[in-house]
C-alpha cells in the first residue's frame, strides 16, 4: 500500500462520539449515529432525503445494495445545530466473512 | 462548507469549495493546484474524518464529513468446500 | 400558550424519597424531549435528568445516577423525577423543561429542601 | 469539557442598546439558548436556537451566533430587564451554562 494513503494511527484528534460506527454482517449494514445529544429525537437522511420512520440512533438495512443505499447519510437531532455526515460505499455479499 | 466525496475510475477523491481539511483517517495526496484530495483506490478502503478549510469565522458552517469504504476484498465466501 | 407545571417539591430527610411531576399544556407533550433542571442555593444551573419523546433513551447526570429515575406518561401529558436516598446536596429548585439540548421554555419550579 | 465565556457584568443606559456576549469554541455550530434570570424568579428562557424569542417574549431581545461568539442584543432596555442572563448549550450529553453576566439599567 502506498506510504502516502495509509491510514493514520493518531485516531484520538475526534472523541470517539463524534464518529459514526458501521457494522456490517453479511447483507445487513447498520449504521450508529454519532451522540447527537444524549436523549434527543433524531432524524436520518439519504443523500439530503428524509428516511421515514427512521427515529433510532441505528439505522440498518438488512438487504443492502452497493449500487442504490450507498452515498451521504446524515444524522442529526432536532435540537443540534451541527448535522453528522457519513460517505458509505460498501459491498456486501450473503455468506461471507472479511479476513484481514 | 460540505465535503464532497467523487470516484474517478479507480479512486475516491474529496473536494471542496477551499481545501480539505483531514481531521483523522487515511492521509491522501492533496493534488497540486487544486482543492481535491486524493484518497487512492477505493479497493484499499479508505476511511477517515475530513472537513472543508474555512476561516475561524466561517468554521463553524464546515461539518465533519466522515467517509467509509468497504470494498470486500478480503472477503471470503463462505461455502461447504470453505468450512470442509 | 406553552405552561409547564411543577409539583411534588417537599421538606424531606436525607435518605428519604419524593416524587416530582411536570404537568405540560400548550403543545403536542408526545413529540418532544423533555429535561429536569435544577438550581442550587449557590445559583449554578445543572441539568439533572432528560427522556426522549417515546421514553425510549433517558439521561441522568453522575451526581443523581442511580438515585433518580425519569419517566413520562405521554396520555397524561406528565413527566415524572422520582428521587430516592435524597442527600443535602440535592436541595434545589427543581425545575421542568421542554426540549433536549435546546430547551425553550421552563417551568416555574418546585422547590426541594434536604435536612435532618 | 466545552466551556461558554460571559462578561460579569454590563451596563446600560436606560433605552440605550445593550450588547451580553458568549464566547465558546465554534460555537457557531451548536444552538444557543439565553436565560434570563431576574432575581428572586425564576430562569426564562428569552432566545432559543440563536434567534428565536418564546411566546411572550418583547421584540427587544435578539440573538446572532457564528463562529466564536453568541451575542444577545437587548435594543432599547428597559429598567424591568435588569437581571441575570446565562448563555446555554447542549454538548455531547449534558447542558453548558455561561457564568452568567449581570445587566445593570442605568437610569
Known amino acids: 500500500q502506498d506510504e502516502d494513503f495509509k491510514a493514520s494511527d493518531d485516531l484520538t484528534s475526534i472523541s470517539p462520539e463524534k464518529r459514526f460506527k458501521v457494522s456490517i454482517s453479511g447483507t445487513e449494514v447498520v449504521v450508529t449515529c454519532p451522540d447527537v445529544f444524549g436523549y434527543d429525537n433524531i432524524k436520518w437522511e439519504k443523500n439530503d432525503n428524509l428516511v421515514e420512520g427512521a427515529s433510532n440512533r441505528e439505522l440498518s438495512q438488512k438487504e443492502f445494495s452497493e449500487v442504490d443505499d450507498s452515498g451521504y447519510y446524515a444524522c442529526y437531532a432536532d435540537s443540534i445545530k451541527e448535522k453528522s455526515y457519513l460517505y458509505l460505499r460498501a459491498r456486501v455479499c450473503a455468506n461471507c466473512i472479511e479476513v484481514n | 462548507f460540505k465535503v464532497s466525496v467523487e470516484e474517478l475510475e479507480d479512486r475516491v477523491f474529496l473536494s471542496c469549495n477551499t481545501s480539505v481539511l483531514r481531521i483523522e483517517g487515511t492521509m491522501g495526496i492533496q493534488l497540486p493546484h487544486s482543492r481535491t484530495l486524493d484518497l487512492g483506490k477505493r479497493i484499499l478502503d479508505p476511511r477517515g474524518i475530513y472537513r472543508c478549510n474555512a476561516t475561524e469565522e466561517q468554521s463553524d458552517k464546515a461539518p465533519y464529513m466522515q467517509v467509509y469504504y468497504r470494498m470486500c476484498q478480503n472477503c471470503v465466501e463462505l461455502n461447504s468446500a470453505t468450512l470442509a | 400558550e406553552v405552561q409547564l407545571v411543577e409539583s411534588g417539591g417537599d421538606l424531606v430527610k436525607p435518605a428519604g424519597s419524593l416524587r416530582l411531576s411536570c404537568v405540560a399544556s400548550g403543545f403536542t407533550f408526545s413529540d418532544y424531549s423533555m429535561s429536569w433542571v435544577r438550581q442550587g442555593p449557590e445559583k449554578g444551573l445543572q441539568l439533572v435528568a432528560g427522556?426522549?419523546?417515546?421514553?425510549?433513551?433517558?439521561y441522568y447526570t453522575d451526581a443523581v445516577r442511580g438515585r433518580f429515575t425519569i419517566s413520562r406518561d405521554n396520555a397524561k401529558n406528565t413527566m415524572y423525577l422520582q428521587m430516592n436516598s435524597l442527600r443535602d446536596e440535592d436541595t434545589a429548585i427543581y425545575y421542568c423543561?421542554?426540549?433536549?439540548?435546546?430547551?425553550?421554555?421552563w417551568g416555574q419550579g418546585t422547590l426541594v429542601t434536604v435536612s435532618s | 469539557s466545552y466551556e461558554l465565556t460571559q462578561p460579569p457584568s454590563v451596563n446600560v443606559t436606560l433605552r440605550e442598546t445593550a450588547h451580553i456576549t458568549c464566547g465558546g469554541d465554534r460555537i457557531g455550530s451548536k444552538y444557543v439558548q439565553w436565560i434570563q434570570q431576574i432575581p428572586g424568579q425564576a430562569p426564562v428562557v428569552i432566545i432559543y436556537?440563536?434567534?428565536n424569542r418564546p411566546t411572550g417574549i418583547p421584540e427587544r431581545f435578539s440573538g446572532a451566533n457564528s463562529g466564536n461568539t453568541a451575542t444577545l442584543t437587548i435594543s432599547g432596555a428597559l429598567a424591568e430587564d435588569e437581571a441575570d442572563y446565562y448563555c446555554?448549550?447542549?454538548?455531547?450529553?449534558?447542558?453548558?451554562f455561561g457564568e452568567g453576566t449581570q445587566l445593570t439599567v442605568l437610569r
Open positions: 427522556m426522549n419523546s417515546d421514553g425510549s433513551t433517558t
Open positions: 423543561a421542554k426540549g433536549a439540548a435546546a430547551p425553550d421554555y
Open positions: 436556537k440563536d434567534n
Open positions: 446555554q448549550v447542549g454538548d455531547n450529553y449534558t447542558w453548558v
